[in-house]
């Protein structure tokens, strides 16, 4: 039995920040769970972890230097990533693991979300030509 995960196919981080919502076919509220976000086709980089236990506060952390926060919904976890760099444009995969009560459950691999990080471009003020002199 696997949990199904839905993610947006693509998100654009215009201001170097993005909200990525992972929607699960499973209610997490009465479970001890570990939701994580992974970067790359091979999911090699664990970007952010949200650890939840119904009786305690959420724990959110990154061991890979990402600036992240997380919020829990009934059947979703939203990862808020900030201070992203252009070179962190990549595909990101949501993962969910239900640790307790048993049995252990995890998800079918999702299609992932391409996060396109747009660099901050300072737009110069348009130059208006002054009054023409004879």
């Amino acid at each position: 039995n696997k949990i199904l995960v839905k993610q947006s196919p693509m998100l654009v981080a215009y201001d170097n920040a993005v909200n990525l919502s992972c929607k699960y076919s499973y209610n997490l509220f009465s479970r001890e769970f570990r939701a994580s976000l992974h970067k790359g086709l091979d999911s090699a980089v664990e970007v952010c972890v949200v650890y939840g236990n119904y009786s305690q506060q959420l724990q959110v952390y990154s061991k890979t230097g990402f600036n992240c926060d997380g919020k829990l919904g009934n059947e979703s976890v939203t990862f808020y990533l900030q201070n992203l760099y252009v070179n962190q444009t990549d595909i990101y995969f949501c993962k969910i693991e239900v640790m307790y009560p048993p049995p252990y459950l995890d998800n079918e691999k999702s299609n992932g979300t391409i996060i396109h990080v747009k660099g901050k471009h300072l737009c110069p003020s348009p130059l208006f030509p002054g009054p023409s002199k004879p």
């Epitope: 499973y26 209610n27 509220f29 009465s30 119904y54 009560p101 048993p102 049995p103």
Partner: antibody, heavy 116, light 107 residues
Framework: LQQSGAELVKPGASVRLSCKAS????????IHWIKLRSGQGLEWIGW????????QYNAKFKGKATLTADKSSSTVYMELTGLTSEDSAVYFC??????????????WGQGTMVTV | DIQMTQSPASLSVSVGETVTITCRTN??????LAWYQQKQGKSPQLLIY???HLVEGVPSRFSGSGSGTQYSLKITSLQSEDFGNYYC?????????FGGGTKLEIK
């Protein structure tokens, strides 16, 4: 879930009740135990997970009930010790199913009557 | 531990009538609640899980509602086979306490 037959026991004695599972993978489901005393309501005793031998007890039944299992026979056991008239009841086992993150007990044994 | 307060403890109603049984908890259980029917000498039967979801095969005259700390089981057009005891049970951590039960008698 097939439960063992009725038991008539003396005060202070112990008894072991069994709950034999069939028709599903034994190690993938939690088994709960519930007590029903005559004229009273259902009382939750605890649960046992055969996959990892995880156990949860109601604090009220710690020292009274001990849950174990035998994977080879797909059977969960509950031993009750130091029996008194208060332990005279029907004891049910029930399988916990996970409905996408919500729990319930859809499958129950027929119950075992214990008379002290 | 979560306390379950079920009411009424008993009620006597006529066939065709509608009854509502309520279950209150002392803290939010986020709809992690089930309802069971038990007839004399039989095992309990699951009617509703997740507070509102009807189990397959259970007549549609049974319905569950509620959220937070207050939940209800409603039986419309009561039939003679609906007599027996009804229990709520929470699954918000352990112990998975049952309500005290409601004895439903047919007038």
């Amino acid at each position: 879930l097939q439960q063992s037959g009725a038991e008539l026991v003396k005060p202070g004695a112990s008894v072991r009740l069994s709950c034999k599972a069939s028709g599903y993978t034994f190690t993938e489901y939690i088994i709960h135990w519930i007590k029903l005393r005559s004229g009273q309501g259902l009382e939750w005793i605890g649960w046992f997970y055969p996959g990892s031998n995880d156990i949860q007890y109601n604090a009220k039944f710690k020292g009274k009930a001990t849950l174990t299992a035998d994977k080879s026979s797909s059977t969960v056991y509950m031993e009750l010790t130091g029996l008194t008239s208060e332990d005279s009841a029907v004891y049910f086992c029930a399988r916990r199913d996970d409905f996408s993150g919500y729990d319930a007990l859809p499958y129950w044994g027929q119950g075992t009557m214990v008379t002290v | 531990d979560i306390q379950m307060t079920q009411s009424p403890a008993s009620l006597s109603v006529s066939v065709g009538e509608t009854v509502t049984i309520t279950c209150r908890t002392n803290e939010n259980i986020y709809s992690n609640l089930a309802w069971y029917q038990q007839k004399q000498g039989k095992s309990p039967q699951l009617l509703i899980y997740a507070a509102t979801h009807l189990v397959e095969g259970v007549p549609s005259r049974f319905s569950g509602s509620g959220s937070g700390t207050q939940y209800s089981l409603k039986i419309t057009s009561l039939q003679s086979e609906d007599f027996g005891n009804y229990y709520c049970q929470h699954f918000w951590g352990t112990p998975c306490t049952f309500g005290g039960g409601t004895k439903l008698e047919i007038k």
